[in-house]
């Protein structure tokens, strides 16, 4: 039987001569040469060789166990003269044995990693971690050590985990952002003799919010015209924030200030500067200087950092409004203003008055803008603002003058304001009333006295404040002898009356009435009308039966009468 | 006078790409975030992204519907913005205009006169 | 995100008169960050109004806007024939958000 299973080869030999392995022996060799040894299997004859005759192998080259541990070979014995096997075909091991051959590799060559600022003592950054080809099972070829070589006293590593913790207290973002930690992995436990291999870990503190904002100076100026519509920007300020992102977000806000109400400010999103904006309209007149407390604050704090103190700061902010060349303004948004139509030309009417706002109080003139008075019925004084008449009234053909008056600065003519002026025309008698219509009426030949043929009205332009009140009467020269009469009905209304029974219009076809009809008002006006009169035929009913012509065909103001 | 004037705009086939450009002048325009926002023929406004000034990083900021697919960029020395759309879809058919927010960088002041983007097959 | 709801989504009015166009948001937002803009057809936005009350430039003053926390308000006084248009609401927050829109139309 064979009297061997595996053999032991060390790796990485360096002799001259072939490394010897270890011998092939069966208990049937006689020592004579008459049996002949075979290996076959991994790497026989080109890696292992044997000597047919004695049995003893050999390694041709040199061997790494990193490389192929284990080798599996087969043996044979036969008899040389027969050709036949002494011994069953055998299987066996050669192990290579390890040595510490190979340093611990890290798996990465550059680790990146973050850690936030400020963080405690211990915090965890990154785990590196590193390996041995050598053989774990053996020795302590494979047992690796982590050390640090470079970045202490900021950071430790773990000997055996390889985790990177922080190592000091405070490290401060703002003071030192990148951090280069060199670490090492030794092998024999980090004995001496010991193999080792390096990495670098890049570590960058990462921002947390332990800095709040600071205004860079603690009073600001800004000038802004009074005309700035609201909504206006009017100056920036920027709080610096050593912090990043967003804990360096700022809010600004307006705490404390006469003009609180009146400005705003908004944070530039990108640029995170404080916007100071006009809120409402300014008035260079009433307030020329405001001063503001303008406060910066983060809005996302963090409460471990409170301690640093009040994470918020303020400056003073002046605002001088400037004065801007305001046109005049007038003492109302409009007038109304009444004259009598009666009034004499050059009659003053009553007086505008329009003053320069601005704090100089430039001297202003006055006009009439001459698109709205184009018949001139009107003039001002351009020093005092007195509208007066330059033209004869009438209420009766004009009730209401619209005009616009112009108020304009004399030392800048730039600057100028209107204002409407609505002047009433008052009522003066000066309209006699007069018939409503053109009146022609008839009676019958047969007419019986005081029969009413006509109803009478008047009209009259004027509009008196108590109403009108009309009085009807014949005419002087007709009022003796008349075959008529006229009763005044005392509600601006006249009746014609027959006088007699009976007409003959053979006789007398027409009858001229000559109507006196006056106002109640003063001066008393007054106007005489003509009625005409003609006679006709009619039937028993009083229906007119035949006229002359000329009375049959006037169009209107016929009147049956009775 | 702040002038925003789109370019690039055409006629592409749905899966297809196209890159729009905006020249902008008569502002600082690296003070300023800019934006892209489209409206498809008959409908509403739809903002499209967003490219924050350097201070910010050049942060980008997407609608859902084009995100993974359109990437907007700025070149700051050319007063440029620019808009990359890959994978173009019939949906992305619409006029595209370049806007600058007002002072602050609130709202959107300022409009080019828009670019006709047309996916169709 | 935000959601900005306007409403009415569609109005007729005639001239002269006064119309009131609201914005509701589905989550608390600063005024600060809430703005109004008049487009016309075939024509780019218009700002109107930032930062929930402050007109921008050249804008009349028959605009006005109002509102804080989720509710805010367009009004515009005595509407005027140029002033026919569809108009939109958007806050600040990333992402951006506009309301639906808001078409004014003649009576």
């Known amino acids: 039987s064979w009297m061997w299973n595996q053999f032991f080869l060390l790796e990485e030999y360096t002799g001259s001569d072939y490394q010897y392995v270890g011998k092939l022996h069966s208990d049937q060799d006689r020592g004579d040469g008459s049996l002949k040894y075979i290996l076959s299997g991994d790497g026989a004859g080109d890696l292992f060789i044997i000597n047919e005759n004695t049995g003893d192998i050999q390694a041709t080259k040199r061997l790494d166990r990193e490389e192929k541990p284990v080798y599996i070979l087969r043996a044979q014995a036969i008899n040389r003269r027969t050709g036949r096997p002494v011994e069953p075909e055998s299987e066996f091991i050669i192990k290579i044995h390890d040595i510490n051959d190979n340093e611990p590799i890290f798996t990465k060559d550059v680790y990146t990693a973050t850690v936030p600022e400020m963080a405690d003592v211990g915090t965890f950054v990154v785990q590196v971690t590193a390996t041995d080809a050598d053989d774990p099972t053996y020795g302590n070829s494979a047992k690796v050590v982590y050390s640090i070589l470079q970045g202490q006293p900021y950071f430790s590593v773990e000997s055996e985990t390889g985790i990177i913790k922080t190592a000091l207290l405070n490290m401060d973002r703002e003071n030192r952002e990148q951090y280069q930690v060199v670490i090492q992995a030794k092998d024999m436990g980090g004995q001496m003799g010991g193999l080792s291999g390096t990495t670098t870990v890049n570590i960058t503190l990462t921002d947390v919010n332990d800095n709040p904002p600071r205004f860079p100076q603690s009073t600001y100026q800004f000038k802004t015209p009074e005309s700035s519509p609201p909504g206006t920007p009017i100056g920036r300020i920027k709080a610096s924030d050593a912090d990043v992102g967003e804990n360096a977000e700022i809010e600004y806000s307006i705490t404390d200030g006469e003009g609180h109400d009146m400005f705003d400010v908004i944070t530039d999103q990108e640029t995170q500067e404080g916007i100071i904006t006009v809120k409402k309209l300014l008035d260079f007149e009433k307030k020329r200087v405001y001063t503001l407390k303008v406060e910066a604050s983060n809005p996302h704090i963090e409460p471990r950092f409170l301690y640093l103190g009040p994470f918020k700061d303020s400056a003073t902010v002046r605002i001088v409004v400037d004065d801007v060349d305001e046109p005049p303004v007038f003492s109302k948004p409009a007038y109304i203003l009444q004259i009598r139509e009666d009034a004499q030309i050059n009659t003053t009417i009553g007086s505008v008055a329009a003053q320069d706002p601005d704090a100089a109080r430039n001297p202003v003139k006055y006009s009439v803008d001459r698109h709205t008075d184009m018949d001139r019925i009107f003039n001002i004084d351009s020093g005092n603002g007195s509208i007066f008449t330059s033209k004869l009234l009438d209420r009766e053909t004009l009730l209401w003058h619209n005009i616009t008056v112009i108020a304009t600065e004399i030392n800048n003519p730039k600057q100028s304001s209107r204002v409407p002026l609505y002047i009433k025309v008052l009522d003066v008698n000066d309209n006699a009333p007069e018939f409503a219509e053109f009146y022609e009426t008839f009676v019958c030949e047969k007419a019986k006295a005081d029969q009413l043929i006509q109803t009478l009205h008047a009209v009259d332009k004027d509009d008196p404040y108590s109403g009108h009140q009309f009085s009807f009467s014949l005419a002087p020269e007709a009022a003796s002898g008349s075959n008529f009469t006229i009763q005044d009905n005392k509600d601006n209304t006249a009746g014609i009356l027959t006088r007699k029974n009976g007409y003959n219009r053979h006789e007398m076809s027409t009858y001229l009435l000559p109507v006196v009809i006056s106002d109640n008002d003063y001066p008393v006006q007054s106007s005489t009308g003509t009625v005409t009169v003609r006679v006709c035929a009619c039937d028993h009913h009083g229906n007119m039966q035949s006229c002359h012509a000329e009375a049959l065909i006037h169009p209107t103001g016929l009147s049956t009468g009775a | 006078e702040v002038q925003l004037v789109e370019s690039g705009g055409g006629l592409v086939q749905p899966g297809g790409s196209l890159r729009l450009s905006c020249a902008a002048s008569?502002?600082?325009?690296?003070?300023?975030?800019m934006n892209w926002v489209r409206q498809a023929p008959g409908k509403g406004l739809e903002w499209v992204a967003r490219i924050r000034i350097k201070n910010n990083n050049y942060a980008t900021y997407y609608a859902d519907s084009v995100t993974d697919r359109f990437t907007i960029s700025r070149d700051d020395s050319k007063n440029s913005l620019y808009l990359q759309m890959n994978s173009l879809k019939t949906e992305d058919t619409a006029v595209y205009y370049c806007?600058?927010?007002?002072?602050?960088?609130?709202?959107?002041?300022?409009w080019g006169q828009g670019t006709l983007v047309t996916v169709s097959s | 995100d935000i959601q900005l709801t306007q409403s009415p989504s569609s109005l007729s009015a005639s001239v002269g008169d006064r119309v009131t166009i609201t914005c509701s948001a589905s989550?608390?937002?600063?005024?600060?960050?809430l703005h109004w803009y008049q487009q016309k057809p075939g024509k780019s936005p218009k700002l109107l109004i930032y930062r929930s009350f402050y007109l921008a430039s050249g804008v009349p003053s028959r605009f006005s806007g109002s509102g804080s926390g989720t509710d805010f308000t367009l009004t515009i006084s005595s509407l005027q024939p140029e002033d026919f248009a569809t108009y939109y609401c958007?806050?600040?927050?990333?992402?951006?958000?506009f309301g639906q829109g808001t078409k004014l139309e003649i009576k």
């Open positions: 806007v600058r927010p007002d002072y602050g960088n609130y709202g959107l002041a300022y």
């Open positions: 989550s608390s937002i600063s005024s600060h960050y």
């Open positions: 958007q806050q600040d927050i990333v992402p951006l958000t």
């Open positions: 008569g502002f600082t325009f690296t003070t300023y975030a």
